[in-house]
Interface confidence: low
């Protein structure tokens, strides 16, 4: 059987959810000595790039500028270590938001409940859609998807002291391209024990654990650093 | 009830702006898009762009996209409308409407009269 | 862009009389159709929604049909204060669009 390299690892920097007309970064992390990256979209090549110095670095970064739909959607990455290539990547979906409208996100009965209670989320959205997506901030990976035509509805059941927190939801006017954001709905659950309600973690959404994590080796230590961390804007 | 209370009729000059506003009440504004309709003295109805009072997010006709401007004033329940480098042609009668899917609530009209 | 065709663009109907006004849209827009009627120096106002829902005020002679690119308005009994012009519109997707309208006149 032809030998081939270990898949690399594909993540998005700061976020698979991308403003349209921002910039994505994505990241494949594969093995000291790579010479080449490629990143695939939708099974095709859509870049190349070569590390320099090739053994001092474990990956790269690819820059998609001016985000919008025809580049949202499935990529994956390989390398190539002399003439051997590695296996691909798993698949990663990049989404494009902040297409036309803005949906309206409550909860009923009410943004404060006890823990038991039943708890219903509202996602209202005036262009047409079939597909809404209810997300908790914190946890992006997390979709909850309910169907629709201007409005859609996620029971959450009896909820817990988990499930407070903040949440918002997009509509989806395909998988790879969703609307602007609603603003956030807090949710507040008094526990069984504790009376008082518990206020939610807040932070900041997306997720923070999506940021691109590469190494680089500076001579006899492999020194872990954050790679132009910051938030594309 | 829910009630679109535009500002007045303008004559303009070639080449200048005009700025229309659209007063909301009866509901909550940020919970619909108001988007802008114009209509030429015998012609039909043509959509400009709608925003999103809730984060501002904008959506435009490509025909108007670098000459409307659409905002939103969350404080004052106010959506405007801007039109730069006017022309003859954008002499009209121009509409907010509030979306919800359909355009359910439609202001009175602000003829925008452009003339040298 | 989703073009919207109405015919005829005038329509001659004696009051108590029926009158079928059509709408094509150039691609499906499954039933994001809306039907407005606009009368001299007012604004439009909206009859149905949806292709066939009600709205709330409007009277029950006014129905509309259809799905994907074929849509329908149906003034069962014309009363004189239907005389106006009637305009559909895309709800689909952006651009939002209107049809050139279809006068509705006295015969």
């Known amino acids: 059987p032809k030998q081939t390299l270990p898949k690399p690892i594909i993540r998005a920097e700061s976020t698979y959810m991308v403003p349209k007309e921002k910039q994505a970064t994505l990241c494949c992390q594969g093995s000291y000595g790579a010479v080449e990256y490629q990143l695939h979209f939708e099974g095709s090549l859509f870049a190349v790039e070569r590390p320099k110095p090739p053994e001092r670095i474990n990956g790269v970064k690819f820059h998609i500028p001016d985000m919008n739909s025809r580049k949202a959607g499935r990529y994956s990455c390989i390398y190539r270590v002399g003439e051997l290539w590695s296996e691909r990547s798993d698949l990663l979906d990049l989404v494009v938001t902040e297409m036309y409208d803005t949906p309206t996100l409550s909860v009923h009965p009410g943004p404060e409940v006890t823990s038991g209670e039943k708890v219903t989320f509202y996602c209202r959205l005036d262009t047409a859609t079939s597909m809404f997506l209810l997300l908790k901030e914190g946890r992006s990976r997390d979709v909850q998807r309910s169907y629709g035509k201007v409005q859609a509805e996620f029971p959450m059941g009896p909820v817990t002291t988990a499930h407070r927190g903040s949440y918002r939801c997009f509509g989806s006017y395909n998988n790879y391209a969703w609307s602007f954001p609603s603003e956030p709905v807090k949710l507040l659950v008094t526990g069984d024990i504790e009376n008082t309600s518990l206020a939610p973690t807040d932070p900041t959404f997306p997720d923070s654990w999506d940021t691109c994590l590469l190494t680089r080796e500076t001579g006899l230590q492999k020194d872990l650093a954050l790679w132009d961390h910051t938030a594309q804007n | 009830q829910v009630q679109l209370v535009q500002s007045g009729a303008e004559v303009k000059k070639p080449g200048s702006s005009v700025k229309v506003s659209c007063k909301a009440s009866?509901?909550?504004?940020?919970?619909?898009?108001m988007h802008w309709v114009r209509q030429a003295p015998g012609q039909g109805l043509e959509w400009i762009g709608g925003?999103?009072?809730?984060?501002?997010?904008?959506s435009y006709n490509q025909k108007f996209k670098g000459r409307a401007t659409l905002t939103a004033d969350k404080s004052t329940s106010t959506a405007y409308m801007e039109l730069s480098s006017l022309r003859s042609e954008d002499t009209a009668v121009y509409y907010c409407?509030?979306?919800?899917?359909?355009?359910?609530?439609w202001g009175q009209g602000t003829t925008v009269t452009v003339s040298s | 862009e989703i073009v919207m065709t109405q015919s005829p663009a005038t329509l001659s109907v004696s009051p108590g009389e029926r009158a079928t006004l059509s709408c094509r849209a150039s691609?499906?827009?499954?039933?994001?159709l809306h039907w407005y009627q606009q009368k001299p120096g007012q604004a439009p106002r909206l009859l149905i929604k949806?292709?066939?829902q009600s709205i709330s005020g409007i009277p029950a002679r006014f129905s509309g049909s259809g799905s994907g690119t074929d849509f329908t308005l149906t003034i069962s009994s014309l009363e004189p204060e239907d005389f106006a012009v009637y305009y559909c519109?895309?709800?689909?997707?952006?651009?939002?669009?209107f049809g050139q309208g279809t006068k509705l006149e006295i015969k």
């Open positions: 409407a509030r979306r919800g899917g359909s355009f359910d609530y």
């Open positions: 009866g509901y909550t504004f940020s919970e619909y898009t």
């Open positions: 925003i999103s009072p809730n984060i501002g997010g904008t």
């Open positions: 691609q499906s827009i499954s039933d994001y």
């Open positions: 949806y292709a066939s």
């Open positions: 519109q895309n709800g689909h997707s952006f651009p939002l669009t």
